[in-house]
Amino acid sequence: MGVEGCTKCIKYLLFVFNFVFWLAGGVILGVALWLRHDPQTTNLLYLELGDKPAPNTFYVGIYILIAVGAVMMFVGFLGCYGAIQESQCLLGTFFTCLVILFACEVAAGIWGFVNKDQIAKDVKQFYDQALQQAVVDDDANNAKAVVKTFHETLDCCGSSTLTALTTSVLKNNACPSGSNIISNLFKEDCHQKIDDLFSGKLYLIGIAAIVVAVIMIFEMILSMVLCCGIRNSSVY
């Protein structure tokens, strides 16, 4: 016999919630795998760039995205399938995973706050290497997509450490409309915008982390309530 009333409402709420979560994980994983395995990007691992360092931060970032997407899909599946099947085992595993993820988020938050300068440096390096790839291999659509995301999200274009060729390519092709790289190259510096984000706008990252934490706590409560509801309904 299945759950009834309010518990049934929680069951479908948990299902919908985790289905969206699973879907989001799938999108992140898909994009990350596309970024990693697209021939244009893969070729760049073996491309000679003269005196420039080989891309590495770019790939570390992609591997992080792959891991995040995979975990989201796995946890989303547990919650989704566990709720619809009314499986105490799956919901218990889902709850355990959420507790671990919550602990990881808290740990990551503390570590991130302590190492925010290093993270900002890595993000800048990630941007530089994506930009380098977009310029060196003009067919690297994935790298172009990353650069475009940076430019549009942070409303910036380029950095003060650009090479001549990169400046020229940006000026003609990759700057958001309305930004004039010729006169505003150093005013709309993406490096500066990244630094600003990790210092002056750190509260935005904090708010995002709190929202994620609240959602996780909410999901933990729902899964426990549903688990108890299933246990009680199986008694009668």
Epitope: L47, E48, L49, G50, D51, K52, V135, V136, D137, D138, D139, S160, T161, T163, A164, L165, T167, S168, V169, K171, N172, N173, I182, L185
Partner: antibody, heavy 119, light 112 residues
């Protein structure tokens, strides 16, 4: 050994057209940006244009914009410069040069081809 | 009028040290763009001599050295030889003009 060989230069009347070619060998042509640089008789060097490896990105000096078109054929390892509406001030030796992304400069140059615009 | 200013000529006797200057502005050399030097022997194409302000490509003798300070760069040739007689050009990128710019060139004469 990197080799760049220009051809197609010659005498042309003002308003006329000319197409320069540059045959490349000794390196992976399809992975490199290429450029044209010119030198008027007895004068200094002037950058004219560049093209990216897959022809996605191109740029031109203001003095030639709208008149010159740079292109490439990676299957033939050849770079081109189509010059239209030629003027007397376009008279120069035109050099084809490989652009090094790593070094951010023109690292290899061809021997040049002379274009004379005169009536 | 070139964006990068070089002395039209320079001279020295064999074994001497000669310096060629290249003066730019805050939109090219001063903006952080690298300065490169090319040597053009009479009747030949330019050849890369110094890249990235002070680096020598393989095959270029260590008698040639480059440096950069503020909005200027310079090329130094020590132990001058007769085969060094050529035109020398500096090159950078100008962010205001959005073009690669060259100096007017310096004709180096080796006397005696």
């Amino acid at each position: 050994e990197v080799q760049l060989l220009e051809s197609g230069g010659g005498l042309v009347q003002p308003g006329g057209s000319l197409r320069l070619s540059c045959a490349a060998s000794g390196f992976t042509f399809s992975s490199n940006y290429m450029s044209w640089v010119r030198q008027a008789p007895g004068k200094g060097l002037e950058w004219v244009s560049y093209i990216s490896s897959s022809s996605t990105y191109t740029d031109y000096a203001d003095s030639v914009k709208g008149r010159f078109t740079i292109s490439r054929d990676n299957s033939k390892n050849t770079l081109y410069l189509q010059m239209n509406s030629l003027r007397a001030e376009d008279t120069a030796v035109y050099y084809c040069a490989r652009y090094s992304y790593g070094r951010d400069n023109f690292d290899y140059w061809g021997q040049g081809t002379l274009v004379t615009v005169s009536s | 009028q070139s964006v990068l200013t070089q002395p039209p000529s320079a001279s020295g006797t064999p074994g001497q040290r000669v310096t060629i200057s290249c003066t730019g502005s805050t939109s090219n050399i001063g903006a952080g763009y690298d300065t490169h030097w090319y040597q053009q022997l009479p009747g030949t194409a330019p050849k890369l001599l110094i890249y990235g302000n002070s680096n020598r490509p393989s095959g270029v003798p260590d008698r040639f050295s480059g440096s950069k300070s503020g909005t200027s760069a310079s090329l130094a040739i020590s132990g001058l030889r007769s085969e060094d007689e050529a035109d020398y050009y500096c090159q950078s990128y100008d962010t205001n003009l959005s073009v690669w710019v060259f100096g007017g060139g310096t004709k180096l004469t080796v006397l005696g």
